[in-house]
Amino acid sequence: AGVFELQIHSFGPGPGPGAPRSPCSARLPCRLFFRVCLKPGLSEEAAESPCALGAALSARGPVYTEQPGAPAPDLPLPDGLLQVPFRDAWPGTFSFIIETWREELGDQIGGPAWSLLARVAGRRRLAAGGPWARDIQRAGAWELRFSYRARCEPPAVGTACTRLCRPRSAPSRCGPGLRPCAPLEDECEAPLVCRAGCSPEHGFCEQPGECRCLEGWTGPLCTVPVSTSSCLSPRGPSSATTGCLVPGPGPCDGNPCANGGSCSETPRSFECTCPRGFYGLRCEVSGVTCADGPCFNGGLCVGGADPDSAYICHCPPGFQGSNCEKRVDRCSLQPCRNGGLCLDLGHALRCRCRAGFAGPRCEHDLDDCAGRACANGGTCVEGGGAHRCSCALGFGGRDCRERADPCAARPCAHGGRCYAHFSGLVCACAPGYMGARCEFPVHPDGASALPAAPPGLRPGDPQRYL
């Protein structure tokens, strides 16, 4: 048994161009917290596969508010270590996922909203009891600096936390063949109970007489390295130089799978099929429990009351993923009207409206005519978020405030002369034409193409356009 410890040193913009925007603002202050997920082995596992070695959540960091105009600095971090206890042997090789989460502290309905800011992952070799290992990982424009180590919990010692130490029975020295337990020099190694010849570096046991191998080693005494090159068969050529499995005992001999797991050989090694509730290369690790708080965003954890039963997160509406860490894309329903851009903030949907529209869903066509009368008897006409004035005769301009020259457009046809008049324009028609715009020819016999002119108005006289 032991504890994996993670110390976050900094989280902020990485080097190079394209610095990220601060995740917090004066309007939406926020604070960070971190989640670590550990899995045994070096296999590329999906982000959603169980955190079989364990998971932990940090405390919340200090509240941070962006300084307007300032670049995003390293953000204030939570105090303390993230600690992931492990019950069984430390596997020596492990995969990690470290997530940086943002908790928004605005006045949103229903409490704070969480969103995933960055996720980094990696695979490492690490011996328990060793010094702190430093690491830098980048996620997009963000950079995370951290250190980690695995340490054994007494009475366990060793690179896999599988050797046990006991207080000395005699004050001066340990019993025959037993060494002092560094760094606990006042304690002695417990008597070995593993199978005779079991490799002290690559093997361990939890029951007398057994020999179980750490990852990368196989054979009845855990002395055979598992091949990293391809062999002709599971029992490939017998050569110390190839690193292939030697003929003789197969990788499943002695069943390396713990907790009732069943072993099957693979071309390079073996594979354990684990019973419900157990994970890892050898089924040596039990799953995360609900006590570890694996469900995000208010997800309800069921099952997983003890390490022998797997947990399930029942996600609240709008969230999904095995840990309720993903949002449902509500913007795909296109709730914003009039071409507005949809933003899902988690606690609410927001619409960024196009010019001329407003409202929570861009539903309001901005009424530019409200309180903006057109002058001189003009009428306001709306459309597409803009407005225009339809001006009375003799006036023009945006608000009908300019006196229009009614003759500017040369409205009189067939050479008629135009005169501006207080109520519009008047056309004085050339001989042979008549009408308000001199548009009608006078027939040669003196009759017009129009009904008879009103009394007192002869063809060719100026006609006033009303």
Partner: nanobody, 119 residues
Framework: EVQLVQSGGGLVQPGGSLRLSCAAS????????IGWYRQAPGKQRDMVAG???????TYADSVKGRFTISRDNAKNTVYLQMNSLKPEDTAVYYC?????????????WGQGTQVTVKP
């Protein structure tokens, strides 16, 4: 508070049809956008079909030509007619609505309806 109550669903053979309905109830509300999402085991919850805020119908590419969304405004009900069903349509189907209550907009989900397509 607005309730979205779903009905329909069930087991059907490939090539068969089903009709889902979703009735919205509550007081003093108006529906802005409404539609259907679905979630297959181990997969994301994705939009299937809907009426957008502008009242336009929208469909996921995988269901175009097979599924039809319709509504009855008088009953505040939306329907999803599913034809030519395939095994990959098996999922829990959720009704979703963006609803205006007073001056605010809120998002609501139905309780979910299982649709299983298998021979």
């Amino acid at each position: 508070e607005v309730q979205l109550v779903q009905s329909g669903g069930g087991l059907v053979q490939p090539g068969g049809s089903l009709r889902l309905s979703c009735a919205a109830s509550g007081s003093d509300f108006s529906i802005n956008a409404i539609g259907w999402y679905r979630q297959a085991p181990g997969k994301q919850r994705d939009m299937v079909a809907g009426f957008t805020g502008d009242g336009v119908t929208t469909y996921a590419d995988s269901v175009k030509g097979r599924f039809t969304i319709s509504r009855d405004n008088a009953k505040n009900t939306v329907y999803l007619q599913m034809n030519s069903l395939k095994p990959e349509d098996t999922a829990v189907y959720y009704c979703a609505a963006d609803v205006k209550i007073g001056g605010d907009y809120e998002w609501f989900w139905g309780q979910g309806t299982q649709v299983t397509v298998k021979p």
